[in-house]
Amino acid sequence: AGVFELQIHSFGPGPGGAPRSPYSARGPCRLFFRVCLKPGLSEEAAESPCALGAALSARGPVYTEQPEAPAPDLPLPNGLLQVPFRDAWPGTFSLIIETWREELGDQIGGPAWSLLARVTRRRRLAAGGPWAGDIQRAGAWELRFSYRARCELPAVGTACTRLCRPRSASRCGPGLRPCAPLEDECEAPPVCRAGCSLEHGFCEQPGECRCLEGWTGPLCMVPVSTSSCLGLRGPSSTTTGCLVPGPGPCDGNPCANGGSCSETPGSFECTCPRGFYGLRCEVSGVTCADGPCFNGGLCVGGADPDSAYICHCPPGFQGSNCEKRVDRCSLQPCRNGGLCLDLGHALRCRCRAGFAGPRCEHDLNDCAGRACANGGTCVEGGGAHRCSCALGFGGRDCRERADPCAARPCAHGGRCYAHFSGLVCACAPGYMGARCEFPVHPDGVSALPAAPPGLRPGDPQRYPHHHHHHHH
């Protein structure tokens, strides 16, 4: 157990010019700060709860806004921000500091809050060390602060996991040694035998493993047998070394939220961690005064410890403390493979090539709404579109006049004539076919099946229009 402490030194415009004034000139204001601690160094920290704890500063002195003047360093609240932690100090953590402005005008619903700046930094810090100073930029603002983590006795060490006894103690309990005369505070517990149960064993000398009542074995992992023990709950038998563990009031630990249980005559008592109270530590002691709502959430109720608070979250956030960002893109509003972007104030779709529209719903390559001019027809395929144009027209949309004879379609010297229903080839002597592609044998017999009845070699060959499409 221990306390993380944060001292804000200054908050104001950074070097290189004053930021755009955040002041609204609607009346007096004051600053306050929120600190949020999260374990580890994850980039995802901003979207997770403040698992190590959070705290809210007092309000700073009231100041009057001056929109035209450059923003000076703003007046700060007095005192430290303190975040108690119950378990081990993790060493690596994410530190989030929010600077809030409270407008004290006559707004409906009380003072208006607005977030001026938020800095998020991942840090390594050993408990018990000196104050660490830092300067961080948030946009054009600059925040100067110091922080440290300190253990609360009997916990000591860089992670607050070692326990100690005051030097005045004449005798130590399980796992604790008297403090050495020359040691500043206390001495670490001895190293027990390897494998000695952390829950049921302890040692007073290095390398030993002594068992708590009800447990036995070289590593204190074996519950004592009930067959040859005393029938009453009481001290361990000197002959068998075992104990009949009757149904004690602390069995199963009835204390919630990390509370520790101690037996009282005929009952139990829970020692609750900070922030919880009640017979079983089941009631949260957090009130709206503690600022439990993150990301601009509005706290309602909770004026005293006996009433709960409710956080009304702003758009884009959820959770009992508004600590979770709503993944509005999870509904997959963008079609055709578009990328959903959450801009905070709105969602936007970034479309793949070939698609458009607010939700990428328009396929720029399909035939929907695509007119092919001059009697052309739209043909879809392969994620693209093309116009199959009527005779005499070409281009992407069949808007260009096309000369059907421009490609010299008549073979072997045949002459091409444009015709309203298609092109016509007049073949040179000795050739026949729609494009004059077939030679005529000297005996007048075609090398291919005979010409249709009534068609003599040398007659013009009409090229039906349905064979002639310009594809672009």
């Epitope: 980039e43 990328l339 970034r350």
Partner: antibody, heavy 121, light 107 residues
């Protein structure tokens, strides 16, 4: 401080496959707030976006290169990779990897220092 | 694909000058445009995002404006370290496309 570092061979033969890896340090590649992109710059010329990948594997490519481009991600190693097949001299460039923020406002805020890949026999 | 054009392609200026670079998109891109500075042998660095938002740590002499198809990067008072090539990037639609660049050198 986030850092990106490109690595891979500096010389590739024509018609072969160019392979590069970008290693991300100082931050997690598995964040939901970022895409991870590849951009290239031929000597003396401008910048061209190649493609981007999300930690879950969702990919966007530049259609001008799509048939030749493959981008993959390895979250366990905090890396993402680029493969460009059938390379020609026109693929000679400095290749950069970069992080693109996709929440709030979109932009490439962190870049690797770049690695020159020459395509030559 | 959305085409981006920049003008001028190069310019010569002196320390203390006010410099303006323009970027034009072939279709409307709202304000989804960034400006990047690149020095020889270095990776590009973000200056402005969302057309007008100054990236943290970038000097306030840099500013951006515009929306739709026409955008401007302004350096209010050119400093020696500002001689570089500047690129605009549209991130409105895929494929993301850069402008051809504007080289700012010493007069």
């Amino acid at each position: 401080q986030l850092q990106l570092q490109e690595s891979g061979p500096g010389l590739v033969k024509p018609s072969e496959t160019l392979s590069l890896t970008c290693t991300v340090s100082g931050g997690s590649i598995s964040s939901s707030s970022y895409y991870w992109g590849w951009i290239r710059q031929p000597p003396g010329k401008g910048l061209e976006w190649i493609g981007s990948i999300y930690y879950s594997g969702n990919i966007y490519h530049n259609p001008s290169l799509k048939s030749r481009v493959s981008i993959s991600v390895d979250t366990s190693k905090n890396q993402f990779s680029l493969r460009l097949s059938s390379v020609t001299a026109a693929d000679t460039a400095v290749y950069y990897c970069a992080r693109e923020i996709i929440v709030g406002a979109t932009h490439f805020d962190y870049w690797g220092q770049g690695t020159l890949v020459t395509v030559s026999s | 694909a959305i085409q981006m054009t920049q003008s001028p392609s190069s310019l010569s200026a002196s320390v203390g000058d006010r410099v303006t670079i323009t970027c034009r998109a072939s279709q409307g891109i709202r304000n989804d445009l960034g400006w990047y500075q690149q020095k020889p042998g270095k990776a590009p660095e973000l200056l402005i995002y969302a057309a007008s938002s100054l990236q943290s740590g970038v000097p306030s002499r840099f500013s951006g404006s515009g929306s739709g198809t026409d955008f401007t990067l302004t350096i209010s008072s050119l400093q020696p370290e500002d001689f570089a090539t500047y690129y605009c990037l549209q991130d409105y639609n895929y494929p993301l496309t850069f402008g051809p660049g504007t080289k700012v050198d010493i007069k």
